[in-house]
């Protein structure tokens, strides 16, 4: 069964910067990835970025840069302009759409005990995976 993993990292150098990493584990080619925060897109969440493998990416503040890392994983850099960081306890959701198989989505948040200096890079395992 295909799965989606989500990992949220705080940047060690800038505590106001966060990166969301998402990946799709399964067969099929990805047609579209939607990243949202505060819940899934369509269920109270706010769209942050949409990534298409051929037509490019679209992003909305506070998203800074959305990009493909591999054919089945993406990263989204976020810039927190406020003094206090609302990202720390926010849920980020990624939805991968593959034609004609369908869509898979998962959500994750920054681990509560996150030490910015110890943030591990994303690995192809379902980290903080919570299928909706």
């Amino acid at each position: 069964t295909p799965e989606v993993w989500v990992q949220v990292q705080m940047e060690a150098t800038e505590l106001s910067s966060f990166t969301v990493h998402c990946g799709f584990l399964g067969p099929g080619s990805i047609s579209l990835v939607t990243v949202s925060w505060g819940g899934p897109d369509g269920a109270g969440g706010t769209k942050l970025a949409v990534l298409h493998p051929e037509l490019g990416t679209r992003q909305w503040a506070p998203a800074r840069q959305a990009r493909w890392e591999t054919q089945s994983s993406i990263s989204l850099a976020l810039e927190d302009s406020g003094a206090s960081s609302p990202f720390a306890n926010t849920t980020f959701c990624c939805k991968f759409a593959s034609f004609p198989e369908g869509s898979w989505e998962s959500c994750g948040s920054l681990p509560p005990s996150s030490d910015p200096g110890l943030s591990a890079p994303p690995t192809p395992v379902p980290i903080l995976r919570a299928d909706l």
Epitope: G28, S29, P40, G42, H52, A97, F99, P100, G102, S103
Partner: antibody, heavy 120, light 107 residues
Framework: DVQLVESGGGLVKLGGSLKLSCVAS????????MSWIRQTPEKRLELVAA????????YYLDTVKGRFTISRDIAKNTLHLQMSSLKSEDTALYYC?????????????WGQGTSVTVSS | SIVMTQTPKFLLVSAGDRVTITCKAS??????VAWYQEKPGQSPKLLMY???HRFTGVPDRFTGSGYGTDFTFTINTVQAEDLAVYFC?????????FGGGTKLEIK
């Protein structure tokens, strides 16, 4: 303007074969996922077969697997549905449709349909 | 496969009435639901995608809502030209499936 025009339908004997075609115009055919949807005499809609824009990933309704083949000819902007070992339950109005990635794969344009009747 | 149960099957209304059609999925389909309109003698046309987004040229009297398993399609002020069959459709998980349709008739 986006246009999809189906042809190839008709009356066919039980166990017979038929090839449906759909000529696309008004958009970059190779960039879109395409499918064949049928409407049964009871007016029920069924997605029969679909093909990814990469022309590799395909989908078939369980009841047509092994009997129907979806393909496309990029040079001729044409989508095909080869149907064989036809059964009475294949009697329907067959539509070709385009899928839009940004619309959650909704079918944003449909052809006018071509009728297939399987008789004994 | 995911079953889309659409109700009611028939609706007889007067012009100006508000109409609501519901679609219930047998499991969550996220927001991957579309609504189509099939007028007599015509092929289906896309009205709504991602539940609540109107397709190009669709009048704003048509609205959609819902998430997960329960979806609603509303025509706020029915007009004579809305005489048609309406279908819901889930493209969340293969095999993609349609509701049974709602035939809207105008008194």
């Amino acid at each position: 303007d986006v246009q999809l025009v189906e042809s190839g339908g008709g009356l066919v004997k039980l166990g017979g074969s038929l090839k449906l075609s759909c000529v696309a115009s008004g958009f970059t055919f190779s960039s879109y996922h395409m499918s064949w949807i049928r409407q049964t005499p009871e007016k029920r809609l069924e997605l029969v077969a679909a093909i990814n824009s990469n022309d590799i990933n395909t989908y078939y309704l369980d009841t047509v697997k092994g009997r129907f083949t979806i393909s496309r000819d990029i040079a001729k902007n044409t989508l095909h549905l080869q149907m064989s070992s036809l059964k009475s339950e294949d009697t329907a109005l067959y539509y070709c449709a385009r899928h839009e990635d940004y619309y959650g794969f909704a079918m944003d344009y449909w052809g006018q349909g071509t009728s297939v009747t399987v008789s004994s | 496969s995911i079953v889309m149960t659409q109700t009611p099957k028939f609706l007889l209304v007067s012009a100006g009435d508000r109409v609501t059609i519901t679609c219930k999925a047998s499991q969550s389909v996220s927001n991957d639901v579309a609504w189509y309109q099939e007028k007599p003698g015509q092929s289906p046309k896309l009205l709504m995608y991602y539940v609540s987004h109107r397709f190009t040229g669709v009048p704003d009297r048509f609205t959609g809502s819902g998430y997960g398993t329960d979806f609603t399609f509303t025509i706020n002020t029915v007009q004579a030209e809305d005489l048609a069959v309406y279908f819901c459709h889930q493209a969340y998980r293969s095999p993609w499936t349609f509701g049974g349709g709602t035939k809207l008739e105008i008194k």
